[in-house]
């Protein structure tokens, strides 16, 4: 079941999926001046069996000006611009991508890929949040949001990470030092 919405955004933070559940789709988007090849896939799909998950289909972009040149999927470091899923200020590795059964790793970039990746997540997907540069978490450690099915509708749990600037913290003198990170957003423990 696909999640109806994108993961929630929260002030002064970015999110990233560390691994993608089977069923996740990634749009084959090309950067300005390029388009998908005529017979090319619309999206990549995370599929797998009990032991191994991988991305089906390949995204291929060609120049909008030329009709017959096709470019193979080749990682090009200079093409790896900022994307929604790679905006973190520092590495976050709360899970080992490879060790999660039923999940795919981050797909490698393809030549002339668009600067922002558009994922279509499935129920059970988890994304992790981190404060942007210049802000710090009131609580240390990762905070996440999970796509859940409740009452027949999908929804993302509200992340519990609070990111605060130095000036904001100074309004609250003499208070306890933050220790741990609350996670997720409450959802009923009983499903409908």
């Amino acid at each position: 079941e696909l999640c109806d919405d994108d993961p929630p955004e929260i002030p002064h933070a970015t999110f990233k999926a560390m691994a993608y559940k089977e069923g996740t789709m990634l749009n084959c988007e090309c950067k300005r001046g390029f388009r998908r090849i005529k017979s090319g896939s619309l999206y990549m799909l995370c599929t797998g069996n009990s032991s191994h998950s991988s991305w089906d289909n390949q995204c291929q972009c060609t120049s909008s000006a030329t009709r017959n040149t096709t470019k193979q999927v080749t990682p090009q470091p200079e093409e790896q611009k900022e994307r929604k899923t790679t905006e973190m200020q520092s590495p976050m590795q709360p899970v080992d991508q490879a060790s999660l059964p039923g999940h795919c790793r981050e797909p490698p970039p393809w030549e002339n890929e668009a600067t922002e990746r558009i994922y279509h997540f499935v129920v059970g997907q988890m994304v992790y949040y981190q404060c942007v540069q210049g802000y710090r978490a009131l609580h240390r450690g990762p905070a996440e949001s999970v796509c859940k099915m409740t009452h027949g509708k999908t929804r993302w749990t509200q992340p519990q990470l609070i990111c605060t600037g130095e000036m904001e913290t100074s309004q609250f003198p003499g208070e306890e030092k933050p220790q741990a990170s609350p996670e997720g957003r409450p959802e009923s423990e009983t499903s409908c």
Epitope: Q158, P178, G184, P186
Partner: antibody, heavy 116, light 107 residues
Framework: QVQLVQSGAEVKKPGESLKISCKGS????????IVWVRQMPGKGLEWMGI????????RYSPSFQGQVTFSADKSISTAYLQWSSLKASDTAMYYC?????????WGQGTLVTVSS | DIVMTQSPSTLSASVGDRVTITCRAS??????LAWYQQKPGKAPKLLIY???SLESGVPSRFSGSGSGTEFTLTISSLQPDDFATYYC?????????FGGGTKVEIK
């Protein structure tokens, strides 16, 4: 389902102490920020502050700093709001809610009346 | 603190009317704004978050718009159940602040 149940209405005299409660159920209580909100009679909503029941990290609104204390007992999934010396101006409805941003789940409120 | 100013403070309307409530922030809050409905003796109920996202189970006649410092809550066709007080709330800072409220009453 997710529920926050608050303790019953209180009538107190100025100078008395008071502790009201907010019990969470249907979710993992220690993992979520609890927000306290005051509503004085016929007035709007005011954010008092937040507490993380997992480790009792607190943040108070400057208006309420030193006037109230937040605490939590995770063994019974309950957050508390307390006063050591009540004033007539503390007369209000007090709500707990699950935060920290938009407040999706609320307690039913506890009416505190302080009168001599 | 970020100051939230709501207008009007009272609004008289009839069933079927299109109703618009405005909320202004004293500084830019991006889209970090929520709207609540409160009925007498009850806790507030979340209607909209992130300025325009409709909370699950809230009727589609409610909509929110705006960003930066100017926001609106619109009820496209007022229903008898909609007579209540409405509050905006910013969460650009975790030190939350609410607007003063708009009471929607029967004309």
């Amino acid at each position: 389902q997710v529920q926050l149940v608050q303790s019953g209405a209180e009538v107190k005299k100025p100078g008395e102490s008071l502790k009201i409660s907010c019990k969470g159920s249907g979710y993992s209580f220690t993992n979520y920020w609890i927000v306290w909100v005051r509503q004085m009679p016929g007035k709007g909503l005011e954010w008092m502050g937040i507490i993380s029941p997992g480790d009792s990290t607190t943040r108070y609104s400057p208006s309420f700093q030193g006037q109230v204390t937040f605490s939590a007992d995770k063994s019974i999934s309950t957050a508390y709001l307390q006063w050591s010396s009540l004033k007539a101006s503390d007369t209000a409805m007090y709500y707990c809610a699950i935060g920290p941003y938009y407040l999706e789940y609320w307690g039913q409120g506890t009416l505190v009346t302080v009168s001599s | 603190d970020i100051v939230m100013t709501q207008s009007p403070s009272t609004l008289s309307a009839s069933v079927g009317d299109r109703v618009t409530i405005t909320c202004r922030a004293s500084q830019s809050i991006s889209s970090w704004l929520a709207w609540y409905q409160q009925k007498p003796g009850k806790a507030p109920k979340l209607l909209i978050y992130k300025a325009s996202s409709l909370e699950s189970g809230v009727p589609s006649r409610f909509s929110g718009s705006g960003s930066g410092t100017e926001f609106t809550l619109t009820i496209s066709s007022l229903q008898p159940d909609d007579f209540a007080t409405y509050y905006c709330q910013q969460y650009n800072s975790y030190s939350l602040t609410f607007g003063g409220g708009t009471k929607v009453e029967i004309k």
